[in-house]
Interface confidence: low
Amino acid sequence: FERTRSLQDPCSNCPAGTFCDNNRNQICSPCPPNSFSSAGGQRTCDICRQCKGVFRTRKECSSTSNAECDCTPGFHCLGAGCSMCEQDCKQGQELTKKGCKDCCFGTFNDQKRGICRPWTNCSLDGKSVLVNGTKERDVVCGPSPADLSPGASSVTPPAPAREPGHSPQ
C-alpha cells in the first residue's frame, strides 16, 4: 500500500523538515528559515511561532518543530501551548480586572495563579477545625469532638430522612 501511495503521491516521501515543492516537480525542499513541518508529506511549511513581548523562547524553532514559548518572570502560561501569559499574584491573592487583590475572609489561594477558594467546611464532614485557615492556607480539619470523647461510638447512626415540606409524624 505504501509503495502504491508513494507512486501516486510523490509528496508522501517528503520527510518532516521539508515540503513538497510543486514548483520544482514535487521534489522535497527544505523548509525555509523561520518555518517548519512536523510531519512528512506536507505541501507547505508552517511559520514558526515568535515568542515576543511577555513571551520568551523556551525552545527554538527548528525545521521539524515549532518554537515553544513560556512567560517572563512574574507571569505564567495559560491555554494550550502557552497561548497566553497571565500576571502572577502572591499567595493569598487572586487576579481581578483591577489587579491582584487579597483573598476575602473565609477564602484562600496557596498559588501564584488562580482564584481564591473557600476554606473547607469541616462540619460538613462531621469534623472540627484543627488549624484555622488563612489567606494563603486552607483550614486543617481534625476529628470531631464526639470522636474524641471516651466511650463514644465510632459509627454514628444516620439521621432519619425528612422530605421537604412535611412535618415529622
Epitope: 523538515g17 527544505p30 528559515p33 523561520n34 515576543k52 513581548g53 520568551r56 523562547t57 523556551r58 525552545k59 527554538e60 527548528s62 525545521s63 521539524t64 518543530s65 517572563t72
Partner: antibody, heavy 116, light 107 residues
Framework: QVQLVQSGAEVKKPGASVKVSCKAS????????MHWVRQAPGQRLEWMGW????????TYADDFKGRVTITRDTSASTAYMELSSLRSEDTAVYYC?????????WGQGTLVTVSS | DIQMTQSPSSLSASVGDRVTITCKAS??????VAWYQQKPGKAPKLLIY???IRHTGVPSRFSGSGSGTDFTLTISSLQPEDFATYYC?????????FGGGTKVEIK
Amino acid sequence: QVQLVQSGAEVKKPGASVKVSCKASGYTFTDYSMHWVRQAPGQRLEWMGWINTETGEPTYADDFKGRVTITRDTSASTAYMELSSLRSEDTAVYYCARYDYAMDYWGQGTLVTVSS
Amino acid sequence: DIQMTQSPSSLSASVGDRVTITCKASQDVSSAVAWYQQKPGKAPKLLIYWASIRHTGVPSRFSGSGSGTDFTLTISSLQPEDFATYYCQQRYTTPPTFGGGTKVEIK
C-alpha cells in the same frame, strides 16, 4: 551592509566592572536580537546572553547570572554588555553578534584584560 | 546544557583536499546547528545554518549535513584561505552551546 562596531580594548583590576558597547548599522536594529559571546585565550566560544532589542528584555546564561547586565539604546542602535566583579579568568575577547537563525554578523571583538 | 563534541580537534590537509569535520550533540537538536569559521585574531564568520543552508556569500565548496545528534561540515576542495578553526553550535535550546573547535592546518 550590516556592521557591528565594538568599543576598544580595556584593562581592568580584579573586582572592577567593564562595559562594552556594540553599535549596529546597515539594518533595522530592533528587528534582530543581539547576543554576547566571549572567548578566553585558546578556549572555545562561550555564550553569555542576549537581549530582545525590541523590548529590551535580556536573557542570561546561568554561569553569568548576577554578574552580567545586557542593555540597549534603540536611539543609538547600540547594545551594551556590562560584566561586574571581574576576576582574572574573565580575561577574554568579548563579541556581540546579531542573531537571525544563527549568529550571522559579529562585531570585531573587544579584548578585556583583568590583571592586578 | 547540550554538549557539542567536535572531532577531530585538529587536522592537517593540503590545498585541494576534501575535508570533513563532525559534530555530535549530547541530545537531539533537530536541524538547529550552525557552523562558523574563525581565523586568528578575527571574529567568527557564519558559514552554515539550519545544518545545511549556506549563509550569504559562502562559497559552494562548504556544505553541511546531518540532523538529530550527528552533523558534518565538508569542504569539498580546500583552498588556501580555508585554513582556520571551525566551530559547530546548537541553537535548539537555551543556552546555545559551541563545540570545542577543529583547527585545519596546512600539511
